[in-house]
C-alpha cells in the first residue's frame, strides 16, 4: 500500500497503525495516501521537525501512550487537512509555541493525561476551527486570561483532573458555543461571579470533586440551556436561594458529598425536566414542606447518608412522578402517616439504617405501586396490621436487623410474610429479639403455641383490611424478583472520544440499572 513500514499495519482504507516498544522514532516511509495514522504504545520520546511531511492528506493523527516528552515546533507542518490530533497519555510537560500553526482544519485536540504545567494564549491562537479541546489529567495550576479567546467555535472543553486553584471570571468569556465544560477534580475553592455568563449554550458543567465552599447567587443565571450540573464532592454548606432559579432545561443535578445542612423551600426550581437529584452524604437534618415542589418530573431522589431526623408531612409535595426515594442511613425515629401520600408512582423506597421505632398503619396507603421496601436495621418491634395488604406489586421487602417482639401481636406480620413469600425474594429472614425465650429464632418459624400473649392493646388498623394476596388472575402465585441493587453516584465518568462509559459503584441506593439512567 504505497510502502508500509515494517513496524506498522496498513489497511486498504488508508489507515496506518504503528504499535510496539521497539519503535523509537516515527516509522518511515509512511504511505503518502494515509488518512489515519495511529502511533500507540511505543518508546518514541520526541517528535522532530516535519516527520509527517509526505502525508499531507492525513485527517486523524493519534500519538498516544508513548514516552513522548519533547516536540519540535514544526512537527506538524504540512498537515493542513488534519481534523483530529491526539497526544494523550504521553509525558509532555511543555508545548512549544506555534506547534499547532497551520493546522487550519483541526477540530479535535486531545492533550489529556500528560504533565503539562501551563498553557498560554499563543498555544491555541491559530486553532480557530477547534471544536473539542481535552486538557484533563495534567498539572495545570492556572489558566491565563485569553487562553481560549480565539476558540470561538469550541463546543467541548475538559480541564478536569488538574491542579487549578482558581479561575479567572474572564477565561471563558468568548466561548459562546461551548456545550460541555468540565472542571472536575481540581482544587477550586470558589467560582467568581460572572465566570459562566458568556456560556449561553452550555449544556453540561462538571464541577465535582473540588473544594468549592460557596456558590455565588447568580452563578448560573445565564446558562439557560444547562442540562447537567455536577456539584458533588465539594464543600458547599449552603445554597443561595436563587442559585438554581434560571435552569429550566436541567435534567441532572448532583450535590452529594457536600456539607449542606438545610434545604429551603423553592431552592430547586422551577426545573420541569429534572429527573434525578442526588443529595446523599450531606449534613441535612430536616426536610421542610414543599422543598421539592417545583420538581414535577423528578423520578429519583437520593437523600441517604444525611442526618435527617424530621420530615415535614408536605416535604414531598409535588413529586407525583417519583419512582425511587432513598432515605436510608439517616436519624429518622418517626414518620408522619401522610408523608408519602403524594408519591403515587413510587416503586422503591429505602428506609434502612435509621432509628424507626414504629410506622403508621397508613404510611404506604396511597403508594400502591411499591415494588421494594427496605426497612432493615431500624428499631421496629412490630408493624401495624394491614400495612402491606394493598401492595400487590411488592416483590422485595427487607425487615431483618430489627428488634422484633415475637409475642402474639407478631402473628399478623408472621402470617403475611409466610403467605406472601413467593413475592418477597430470598433475603435474610427477620429474627425475634424478644421475649428472651424466642430470641434469635426466625420470626416465621416461631412456635405460635408458645408465643407470649401481648401485654398491650393490639393496634387497630388505620384503614380497612384488604386481601394482601388476592385470589385473582392478576396476581400470580410467584413473581419474578427484580432484586434492587445499590447505586453510589450518578454517571460522571468521562471518556473523551465517542462514548461515555457507565462505571457505577452501587452502594448507596437500591435501584435497577434500567431505572438508574
Amino acid at each position: 500500500y504505497h510502502g508500509c513500514p515494517s513496524e506498522c499495519t496498513c489497511s486498504r482504507a488508508s489507515q496506518v497503525e504503528c504499535t510496539g516498544a521497539r519503535i523509537v522514532a516515527v516509522p518511515t516511509p509512511l504511505p503518502w495516501n494515509a488518512m489515519s495514522l495511529q502511533i500507540l504504545n511505543t518508546h518514541i520520546t520526541e517528535l522532530n521537525e516535519s516527520p509527517f511531511l509526505n502525508i499531507s492528506a492525513l485527517i486523524a493523527l493519534r500519538i498516544e501512550k508513548n514516552e513522548l516528552s519533547r516536540i519540535t515546533p514544526g512537527a506538524f507542518r504540512n498537515l493542513g487537512s488534519l481534523r483530529y490530533l491526539s497526544l494523550a497519555n504521553n509525558k509532555l510537560q511543555v508545548l512549544p509555541i506555534g506547534l499547532f500553526q497551520g493546522l487550519d482544519s483541526l477540530e479535535s485536540l486531545l492533550l489529556s493525561s500528560n504533565q503539562l504545567l501551563q498553557i498560554q494564549p499563543a498555544h491555541f491562537s491559530q486553532c480557530s476551527n477547534l471544536k473539542e479541546l481535552q486538557l484533563h489529567g495534567n498539572h495545570l495550576e492556572y489558566i491565563p486570561d485569553g487562553a481560549f479567546d480565539h476558540l470561538v467555535g469550541l463546543t467541548k472543553l475538559n480541564l478536569g483532573k488538574n491542579s487549578l486553584t482558581h479561575i479567572s471570571p474572564r477565561v471563558f468569556q468568548h466561548l459562546g458555543n461551548l456545550q460541555v465544560l468540565r472542571l472536575y477534580e481540581n482544587r477550586l475553592t470558589d467560582i467568581p461571579m460572572g465566570t459562566f455568563d458568556g456560556l449561553v449554550n452550555l449544556q453540561e458543567l462538571a464541577l465535582q470533586q473540588n473544594q468549592i465552599g460557596l456558590l455565588s447567587p447568580g452563578l448560573f443565571h445565564n446558562n439557560h440551556n444547562l442540562q447537567r450540573l455536577y456539584l458533588s464532592n465539594n464543600h458547599i454548606s449552603q445554597l443561595p436561594p436563587s442559585v438554581f432559579m434560571q435552569l429550566p432545561q436541567l435534567n441532572r443535578l448532583t450535590l452529594f458529598g457536600n456539607s449542606l445542612k438545610e434545604l429551603s423551600p423553592g431552592i430547586f426550581g422551577p426545573m420541569p425536566n429534572l429527573r434525578e437529584l442526588w443529595l446523599y452524604d450531606n449534613h441535612i437534618s430536616s426536610l421542610p414542606d414543599n422543598v421539592f415542589s417545583n420538581l414535577r418530573q423528578l423520578q429519583v431522589l437520593i437523600l441517604s447518608r444525611n442526618q435527617i431526623s424530621f420530615i415535614s408531612p408536605g416535604a414531598f409535595n409535588g413529586l407525583t412522578e417519583l419512582r425511587e426515594l432513598s432515605l436510608h442511613t439517616n436519624a429518622l425515629q418517626d414518620l408522619d402517616g401522610n408523608v408519602f401520600r403524594m408519591l403515587a408512582n413510587l416503586q422503591n423506597i429505602s428506609l434502612q439504617n435509621n432509628r424507626l421505632r414504629q410506622l403508621p398503619g397508613n404510611i404506604f396507603a396511597n403508594v400502591n405501586g411499591l415494588m421494594a421496601i427496605q426497612l432493615q436495621n431500624n428499631q421496629l418491634e412490630n408493624l401495624p396490621l394491614g400495612i402491606f395488604d394493598h401492595l400487590g406489586k411488592l416483590c422485595e421487602l427487607r425487615l431483618y436487623d430489627n428488634p422484633w417482639r415475637c409475642d402474639s401481636d407478631i402473628l399478623p406480620l408472621r402470617n403475611w410474610l409466610l403467605l406472601n413469600q413467593p413475592r418477597l425474594g430470598t433475603d435474610t429472614v427477620p429474627v425475634c429479639f424478644s421475649p428472651a425465650n424466642v430470641r434469635g429464632q426466625s420470626l416465621i418459624i416461631i412456635n405460635v403455641n408458645v408465643a407470649v400473649p401481648s401485654v398491650h392493646v393490639p393496634e387497630v388498623p388505620s384503614y380497612p383490611e384488604t386481601p394482601w394476596y388476592p385470589d385473582t388472575p392478576s396476581y400470580p402465585d410467584t413473581t419474578s424478583v427484580s432484586s434492587t441493587t445499590e447505586l453510589t453516584s450518578p454517571v460522571e465518568d468521562y471518556t473523551d472520544l465517542t462514548t461515555i462509559q457507565v462505571t457505577d459503584d452501587r452502594s448507596v441506593w437500591g435501584m435497577t440499572q434500567a431505572q438508574s439512567g
Epitope: G386, D389, S408, L411, P412, N415, L418, L419, Q421, P422, T426, D427, T428, V429, S442, I444, I445, V448, N449, E465, T466, P467, W468, Y469, P470, D471, D477, T478
Partner: antibody, heavy 113, light 111 residues
C-alpha cells in the same frame, strides 16, 4: 385449648353443593390462617385453599367451584363446594395456621346418585 | 406445581429400631434460608397431626424421637426408636408455594 370442630357428615347428589363449617375456639380466631384439605377414601391428602382476614387463596383445581368464607362473630369458617361429582366423595378437614398445626375431626361428604 | 415423592410406600420396622422416611420435591422448597417442608402423622380414623415443620422444627407435644432433616429438594423424617403407637401413615408436605402439595404417604408398621 385449641379446638376445631367441624359440621356433620353430608350426603349429596351430583351437581349439588355442600357447605362444611369449622368452628374455632381456644385462640384468637383472626390471628390465624384456616386451610381446607380433603382426603378421598384410601387416598392421600389434597390442599384446597385457605382463608385469612377475608383474603382467600384457592388451589387451581377447585377454582370456580370452591368458596371459603368466615364469620368472626362466631369464629367459624365455611367451605362450600359446588357442582359436586362422585370423585368429590372425601373427608374434608379444616386445619389451623400456615403449618397446619391443629386439625378438625373431618367431615365425610358422600356424593352419590 | 411442586410434586412431592415419598419413599418407601410402606415400611416395616421392629420395635425400638430406627425408621427413616424420605421425601423428594420436584424443585427446591427453600426460602429465606428456610426449608418449607412439613411432616404429618395420620392414624386410622383420625385427622393428620403435625410432627415437624420447616424441615426440622418439632410441633407442640411431639416426642423427641421424631426428627426431620434436609434442605432444598431432599428431606428425611426419622423415628429414632419405633414405638407401637407410631404405627400410622406419614405424609410430607411443601408449603413454599401455592398449591401446597403432599407426598403420597408412607405406611409404617411393626415388623
Amino acid at each position: 385449648q385449641v379446638q376445631l370442630v367441624q359440621s356433620g357428615a353430608e350426603v349429596k347428589k351430583p351437581g349439588a353443593s355442600v357447605k362444611v363449617s369449622c368452628k374455632a375456639s381456644g385462640y384468637t380466631f383472626t390471628s390465624f390462617v384456616i386451610h381446607w384439605v380433603r382426603q378421598a377414601p384410601g387416598q392421600g391428602l389434597e390442599w384446597m385453599g385457605y382463608i385469612y382476614n377475608d383474603g382467600t387463596k384457592y388451589n387451581e383445581r377447585f377454582r370456580g367451584r370452591v368458596t371459603m368464607t368466615r364469620d368472626t362473630s362466631t369464629s367459624t369458617v365455611y367451605m362450600e363446594l359446588s357442582s359436586l361429582r362422585s370423585e368429590d366423595t372425601a373427608v374434608y378437614y379444616c386445619a389451623r395456621d400456615y403449618y397446619f398445626d391443629y386439625w378438625g375431626q373431618g367431615t365425610l361428604v358422600t356424593v352419590s346418585s | 406445581d411442586i410434586v412431592m415423592t415419598q419413599s418407601p410406600d410402606s415400611l416395616a420396622v421392629s420395635l425400638g429400631e430406627r425408621a427413616t422416611i424420605n421425601c423428594r420435591a420436584s424443585e427446591s422448597v427453600d426460602y429465606y434460608g428456610i426449608s418449607f417442608m412439613n411432616w404429618y402423622q395420620q392414624k386410622p380414623g383420625q385427622p393428620p397431626k403435625l410432627l415437624i415443620y420447616a424441615a426440622s422444627n418439632q410441633g407442640s407435644g411431639v416426642p423427641d424421637r421424631f426428627s426431620g432433616s434436609g434442605s432444598g429438594t431432599d428431606f428425611t423424617l426419622t423415628i429414632s426408636s419405633l414405638q407401637a403407637e407410631d404405627v400410622a401413615v406419614y405424609y410430607c408436605q411443601q408449603s413454599k408455594e401455592v398449591p401446597y402439595t403432599f407426598g403420597g404417604g408412607t405406611k409404617v408398621e411393626i415388623k
